[in-house]
């Protein structure tokens, strides 16, 4: 199963950690995909390492762990984020986070 904070908030210009936690007695994680709505943010492969989409490479930092640190947030970053865990033996698990970017006070 995937465990995550369903709703998180952060300030404009600040940063936020996007994190999902996967737990299973039998399956091991082989890849994690991170998407902003339908747009790829980054992929982590246990064997191949990290790939960060070029359009986000200046704002997305891999980690901590299998999560992402999203920096220099703008109001346009408000929305749904999805983590997809690929496991072996086969199985796909998906988590959802809603990020609300608030005006800096």
């Amino acid at each position: 199963t995937i465990d995550t904070k369903r709703n998180i908030s952060a300030e404009e210009g600040g940063s936020v950690i996007l994190q999902c936690h996967f737990s299973s007695d039998t399956a091991e994680v082989t890849q994690v995909d991170w998407k902003q709505q339908d747009q790829l943010l980054a992929i982590y492969s246990v064997d191949l390492g990290w790939h960060v989409a070029s359009v986000f490479s200046d704002r997305v930092v891999p980690g901590p762990s299998l999560g992402l640190t999203f920096q220099s947030l703008t109001m346009n970053d408000t929305g749904e984020y999805f983590c997809t865990y690929h496991t072996y033996p086969g199985g796909i698990y998906k988590g959802r986070i809603f990020l609300k970017v608030q005006e800096s006070s």
Partner: antibody
């Protein structure tokens, strides 16, 4: 540019073990960030993934073949190999070695980027 | 295991015409889909990855589309060298699986 070359016997007897080797040239397995894979194609049929190995030794196998398959890598020889035990006529096929995920870091996709030319293996007594 | 189903099994097309090949996944693979071309006696060649991105050196007449469970490979104007068998393949997750193939033949 990395190139692959399969080698091994073209004829194997039923119940014996099929052994194939893939030699990688133009790049070092020990430093390559990609999977080394085996795929087969029975005569007149489609493609079947057999399994993949990473340089660290992590292996992933087709569940339908897992009990009979061993894939290993020899970084000192820049080779990886396939062993398929207890073969039957149904294992007669062209066997391909391939590299998967060579462009992952740059482009974020995992696909079979590079293929060997294939070697035909017939199982018959 | 994700099952990939291709249709039609055979497609008869005249040179210069458009060919549309379909691939369906038994569950969502997002955009993690590749297309390969295989000519008789040759190894397959990667055409499309990420459902829609052409691999290096692949002509612009080849295009891929779709996401989730439904995918399409389109060859806009068939050339003589395009008559071949085409396979779709999902990756990840493990196990990697291929579709049964579509043979594009000369009408």
């Amino acid at each position: 540019q990395v190139q692959l070359q399969e080698s091994g016997p073209g004829l194997v007897k039923p119940s014996e073990t099929l052994s194939l080797t893939c030699t990688v040239s133009g790049g070092s397995i020990s430093s390559g960030s990609y999977y080394l894979a085996w795929i087969r194609q029975p005569p007149g049929k489609g493609l079947e993934w057999i399994g993949s190995i990473f340089r660290s030794g992590s292996t992933y196998y087709n569940p339908s073949l897992e009990s009979r398959v061993t894939i290993s890598v020899d970084t000192s020889k820049n080779q990886f190999s396939l062993k398929l035990s207890s073969v039957t006529a149904a294992d007669t096929a062209v066997y391909y070695c391939a590299i998967e995920g060579a462009n992952f870091k740059d482009f974020g996709y995992v696909a079979f980027d590079i293929w060997g030319q294939g070697t035909m293996v017939t199982v018959s007594s | 295991e994700i099952v990939m189903t291709q249709s039609p099994a055979t497609l008869s097309v005249s040179p210069g015409e458009r060919a549309t090949l379909s691939c369906r996944a038994s569950q969502s693979v997002s955009s993690n889909l590749a297309w390969y071309q295989q000519k008789p006696g040759q190894a397959p060649r990667l055409l499309i990855y990420g459902a829609s991105t052409r691999a290096t050196g692949i002509p612009a007449r080849f295009s891929g589309s779709g996401s989730g469970t439904e995918f399409t490979l389109t060859i806009s104007s068939l050339q003589s060298e395009d008559f071949a068998v085409y396979y779709c393949q999902q990756s990840p997750p493990w196990p990697r699986t291929f579709g049964g193939g579509t043979k594009v033949e000369i009408k």
